[in-house]
């Protein structure tokens, strides 16, 4: 990153070089020589989504005009280092990881957007972005400081499978019970139906006062 600043100063100062001593011009011309190191930047912390997906940007300051770039994601946990995934791409082309890779990514200039999926709590660790400028020579290597990815597994309900079975059984029982009740009620109503009924509301006076509560004051005959 600093290298870009040095080059910018060089461009601005070159306007005035005619009035400056040759030694200064010589010095300015050679400033870029001290800026060859490649620097890689990535976020310090990222929290994975509840679905176990984490995304972060890996940005590098390219010292040369690279046409072939290799990006590798390394995981460091308990001083153990493992390669998570890697992809080589041509500048201007899309970044493609292997089919079985847990990583996907897109590239835009000197920036790579990385997505790691299928993460679980045990995958929490430092994920380091390693960038290599493969072609043309010379080869350049840059390694980021790492992104600490935190993965929290979603808390499952206690005995969720068991509760699901209970819920299914109760629901099924209620459904069949209501089905049976409806069937019985309908059959009783059909038996009681008189062939003389016209389908209008008819006032039914009680025959015995003490039994009044056993009958509805109105009923709707069903055709």
């Amino acid at each position: 990153m600093a290298c870009l600043g040095f080059q910018r100063h060089k461009a601005q100062l070159n306007l005035a070089t005619r009035t400056w001593p040759c030694t200064l011009l010589f010095f300015l011309l050679f400033i870029p020589v001290f800026c060859k190191a490649m620097h890689v930047a990535q976020p310090a912390v990222v929290l994975a989504s509840s679905r176990g997906i984490a995304s972060f940007v890996c940005e590098y300051a390219s010292p040369g005009k690279a046409t072939e770039v290799r990006v590798t994601v390394l995981r460091q946990a308990d001083s153990q280092v493992t390669e998570v995934c890697a992809a080589t791409y041509m500048m201007g082309n899309e970044l493609t990881f292997l089919d079985d890779s847990i990583c996907t990514g897109t590239s835009s200039g000197n920036q790579v957007n990385l997505t790691i999926q299928g993460l679980r709590a045990m995958d929490t660790g430092l994920y380091i972005c390693k960038v290599e400028l493969m072609y043309p020579p010379p080869y350049y290597l840059g390694i980021g400081n790492g992104t600490q990815i935190y993965v929290i597994d979603p808390e499952p309900c206690p005995d969720s499978d068991f509760l699901l079975w209970i819920l299914a059984a109760v629901s099924s029982g209620l459904f069949f019970y209501s089905f049976l009740l409806t069937a019985v009620s309908l059959s009783k109503m059909l038996k009681k139906r008189s062939p003389l009924t016209t389908g209008v509301y008819v006032k039914m006076p009680p025959t015995e006062p003490e039994c009044e509560k056993q009958f509805q004051p109105y009923f709707i005959p069903i055709n």
Epitope: V33, K36, A37, V40, T72, E83, P138, Y140, I143
Partner: antibody, heavy 118, light 108 residues
Amino acid sequence: QVQLVESGGGVVQPGSSLRLSCAASGFTFSSHGMHWVRQAPGKGLEWVAVIWYDGSNKHYADSVKGRFTTSRDNSKNTLHLQMNSLRAEDTAVYFCARGGYFGCVDYWGQGTLVTVSS
Amino acid sequence: EIVLTQSPGTLSLSPGERATLSCRASQSVSSSCLAWYQQKPGQAPRLLIYGASSRATGIPDRFSGSGSGTDFTLTISRLEPEDFAVYYCQQYGISPFTFGPGTKVDIK
């Protein structure tokens, strides 16, 4: 544990050729870049060459460019250094070394001595 | 190529003393791409520090590395008898990779 064993060293005449080999074990050979580093008697370390994990890329020190070629056989866990047009100044102990994930050399073999003398 | 210069050439110290070794690069080196190695007579080198300041597996915490840009330092806080050896710095950020000429730490 990681083991690297070099072989093929010996005494040769200037202008002749020699092929060094390095047998690797104790790690996934096909996942690591491999280096050759040499050390002239009583002198310091000099980096010679590197080959990528899959053999796709190779880089050499200016002093050996065009004369030395490194190759690898991942099926046999073996690394090679073909040395042509040997000079007296190529006399050294040649170390085979593993490239770590972070790019540095993390494990070394014990070395094999190459003497170029008439 | 990047030229690495180490100083001093020889460092004469007693066990228990602090050793400070310097490595200077001819041009800027990414701090993530500088390593330190220890070599004892008749043995292969051993990785001590990588990425300028990260200790390799199994390296005691008396060894520490620091620096950035063109100036890097290896510090041995308290010299143990087994620490008397030659120390090399190496840059692996730009090809060709290069080693420094080494600093010999010997017993005073």
